[in-house]
């Protein structure tokens, strides 16, 4: 379970029940392989193939592939946030990890289902998904990194965070943030949220709002509350410092457009 010694918090996704699946569009016919949408998405989309750019917010890598930042990347988390990872052979990644980060295997990893294998390293299987055959319940990644995920329900944003246990990388992440104090207020809020969440054990992706930041750490124009299934979350527009701009909100029925505002 989540409270087992040595295991940090694991994300709980909304279950993909029949009602959620009924909201999905038929996937494109041209895909070589279909995978679930990013984050807690229930619908199917084309998998990325080997060598394609990937990240936390992008489609998933195909079977046998993992999304990995480049080895010489100074800020691997930021690279994944920015979609600057690459889909690489998972067995090669595992060998590299075993060499760099020796760790005992996580429970439940022995019998990954096809869906799990195709998920890519930026996505661990959802805890309460109702259509997993092997249903490994708590299935943390080997990589011992903190990961932010955004699932797309139409254009909405739904975040979830994975934490690994007793991780030296947690300290590395914190020291990285000290090196980057020139980053904007959004980035700082995001890191504060992550550091706060470090102490929680099981995270609900709908129970936390992680802001939508640009590359410089300022707020992106459009911010959204998490979504449920394919139901859009409440969205609003902000300036670069995160201050809401009046008159630009949506309760989920129609998209909110923030394009004309100076908040980049």
């Amino acid at each position: 379970g989540a409270s087992s010694a040595g295991l940090g918090p694991v994300v709980r996704c909304e279950p993909c029940d029949a009602r959620a699946l009924a909201q999905c569009a038929p996937p494109p016919a041209v895909c070589a392989e279909l995978v679930r949408e990013p984050g807690c998405g229930c619908c199917l989309t084309c998998a990325l193939s080997e060598g394609q750019p990937c990240g936390i917010y992008t489609e998933r890598c195909g079977s046998g592939l993992r999304c990995q930042p480049s080895p010489d990347e100074a800020r691997p988390l930021q690279a994944l946030l920015d979609g600057r990872g690459l889909c690489v052979n998972a067995s090669a990644v595992s060998r590299l990890r075993a060499y760099l980060l020796p760790a005992p295997p996580a429970p439940g990893n022995a019998s990954e289902s096809e869906e799990d294998r195709s998920a890519g390293s930026v996505e661990s299987p959802s805890v309460s998904s109702t259509h997993r055959v092997s249903d490994p319940k708590f299935h943390p990644l080997h990589s011992k990194i903190i990961i932010i995920k955004k699932g797309h329900a139409k254009d909405s944003q739904r975040y979830k965070v994975d934490y690994e246990s007793q991780s030296t990388d947690t300290q590395n992440f914190s020291s990285e943030s000290k090196r980057e104090t020139e980053y904007g207020p959004c980035r700082r809020e995001m890191e504060d949220t992550l550091n706060h969440l470090k102490f929680l054990n099981v995270l609900s992706p709908r129970g936390v709002h992680i802001p939508n930041c640009d590359k410089k750490g300022f707020y992106k124009k459009k911010q959204c509350r998490p979504s449920k299934g394919r139901k859009r979350g409440f969205c609003w527009c902000v300036d670069k410092y995160g201050q809401p701009l009046p008159g630009y909100t949506t309760k989920g029925k129609e998209d909110v457009h923030c394009y004309s505002m100076q908040s980049k």
Epitope: C16, A18, R19, L21, A22, Q23, C24, A25, P26, P27, P28, A29, C31, E33, L34, V35, R36, C43, L44, S113, E114, E115, S118, T130, H131, R132, V133, R230, K231, K253
Partner: antibody, heavy 116, light 108 residues
Framework: QVQLVQSGAEVKKPGASVKVSCKAS????????ISWVRQAPGQGLEWMGW????????TYAKKFQGRVTLTTDTSTSTAYMELRSLTSDDTAAYYC?????????WGQGTLVTVSS | ETTLTQSPGTLSLSPGERATLSCRAS???????LAWYQQKPGQPPRLLIF???SRATGIPDRFSGSGSGTDFTLTISRLEPEDFGVYYC?????????FGQGTKVEIK
């Protein structure tokens, strides 16, 4: 409760067109797409196509592309399926169903008979 | 296009007996995205199982789905009189989604 109610049976001549309606109630129509599935007498199920509830996107099975048109009227929460250039092979029960990959609610079916 | 082959074509059983229906795919069904439907004469199909093993809302627990890859099974642990009809499997792991030809479960 969720309901999909289809229009009545039709008898058509070869070469003609048929338009079947499917009125939805009990849920937010724009949140779910509608698929159309047909079943020839004594035969299995065949997916024809899908349209989003907001009438923005359509996907058609290759076999029916160019011959079928799916539309919706969001003001009345009704989906329509028009099939053109009918032949006797198109004699079947036509079902509307909620969803694009899994179909959780179905209409009662509309029998279309094509006969000269 | 993924072809689904169901067997047997017809299953003759008595109420109270166990029914085992098979669905075999021509290629591996990605993510075990397979559903089962029940259809009674003159009625539309009804969703029973999705994701190979998850029961749809309101479906009794005597219905269970299992399997992965290319081989899937629907089991009815104890047939009730209302369970007789035709059962279809459907894959939605590749596009377009396809149905099997059906298995008829009839009263012996």
């Amino acid at each position: 409760q969720v309901q999909l109610v289809q229009s009545g049976a039709e008898v058509k001549k070869p070469g003609a067109s048929v338009k079947v309606s499917c009125k939805a109630s009990g849920y937010t129509f724009s949140d779910y797409g509608i698929s159309w599935v047909r079943q020839a007498p004594g035969q299995g199920l065949e997916w024809m196509g899908w349209i989003s509830g907001d009438n923005v996107k359509t996907t058609y099975a290759k076999k029916f592309q160019g011959r079928v048109t799916l539309t919706t009227d969001t003001s009345t929460s009704t989906a329509y399926m028009e099939l053109r250039s009918l032949t006797s092979d198109d004699t079947a029960a036509y079902y509307c169903a909620r969803g694009g990959i899994v179909f959780d609610y179905w209409g009662q079916g509309t029998l279309v008979t094509v006969s000269s | 296009e993924t072809t689904l082959t169901q067997s047997p074509g017809t299953l003759s059983l008595s109420p109270g007996e166990r029914a085992t229906l098979s669905c075999r795919a021509s290629q591996s069904v990605s993510g075990n995205y397979l559903a089962w439907y029940q259809q009674k004469p003159g009625q539309p199909p009804r969703l029973l199982i999705f994701g190979a093993s998850s029961r749809a809302t309101g479906i009794p627990d005597r219905f269970s789905g299992s399997g992965s890859g290319t081989d899937f099974t629907l089991t009815i642990s104890r047939l009730e009189p209302e369970d007789f009809g035709v059962y279809y499997c459907q894959q939605y792991g590749s596009s377009p989604g396809t149905f099997g030809q059906g298995t008829k479960v009839e009263i012996k």
